[in-house]
Amino acid sequence: MMTGTIETTGNISAEKGGSIILQCHLSSTTAQVTQVNWEQQDQLLAICNADLGWHISPSFKDRVAPGPGLGLTLQSLTVNDTGEYFCIYHTYPDGTYTGRIFLEVLESSVAEHGARFQIP
């Protein structure tokens, strides 16, 4: 039986050109995490394998950095990065757990009400 739950950073609004950290945390289970996949819509961004470490998809190599932990750092954000991101935890013996984070990237000139949340 799958007893675990995924907690995420929560949805994030950030400015174009900035950076953000996407993080998920699996709790309430003793299952072993074998791999974590990070995906956006139908695209694979990165994989963190318990044995083999990190692999970043070639098309994201210059803008995606592994970590902290099992999280993912997105840099040089563009409006086109707006969308839903998925952390997919592959575990044994439980199976797969999925967390979801929606990222909204705002044009710097139109960021409303001082909503500037990117990491310097």
Partner: antibody, heavy 119, light 112 residues
Framework: EVQLQQSGPELVKPGVSMKISCKAS????????MNWVKQSHGKNLEWLGL????????SYNQKFTGKATITVDKSSNTTYMELFSLTSEDSAVYYC????????????WGQGTSVTVSS | DVVMTQTPLSLPVSFGDQVSISCRSS???????????LSWYLHKPGQSPHLLIY???NRFSGVPDRFSGSGSGTDFTLKISTIKPEDLGMYYC?????????FGGGTKLEIK
Amino acid sequence: EVQLQQSGPELVKPGVSMKISCKASGYSFTGYTMNWVKQSHGKNLEWLGLIFPYNSATSYNQKFTGKATITVDKSSNTTYMELFSLTSEDSAVYYCARGLRGFFALDYWGQGTSVTVSS
Amino acid sequence: DVVMTQTPLSLPVSFGDQVSISCRSSQSLANSYGNTYLSWYLHKPGQSPHLLIYGISNRFSGVPDRFSGSGSGTDFTLKISTIKPEDLGMYYCLQGIHQPWTFGGGTKLEIK
């Protein structure tokens, strides 16, 4: 002035599919998410999902996976929501609502489209 | 999914009253950057819902200052300082921090 104009009321038979439209005007259409909200029995509000017209990115309430698909036509500033295999449970008023940038809230709403599923 | 619990379900009032509506979430509504996406809406009969408060305490444009929002973490409150006839209707809170977004069950503000 921001305006969201939705298509008219629908009376449909169980098992069919249908598409509701929401035409936006008065703002830069591609820069804001468009959300869809269901109101059943005159009370409960449920968020169905959203689309970001700039890149057509979508996010759905998984409760409605397979029930609803949200699409966009940027040339006409129109968002669509298609509902599949309708049952009486889908009888409701459906609203489109623009996302408030930076705050994940809904700042402007359409007038609502009433959908009645009945044989 | 995050459950949003609104109380009371019904709130009988007299014009001029001050009232509070509570909204409690099953998880914290602050993201990792300290931003909290909690908003309040009024839905009047025969109309569409409209935004009153966003980001816990920011009044949307055109909303009178008799409406105010407060709270943090999992507990949030909408206060209306002097009830007027146009304030009657259903009030809803909405969290937009966790997927999927979820509404509270609503509070009906009605005349005594």
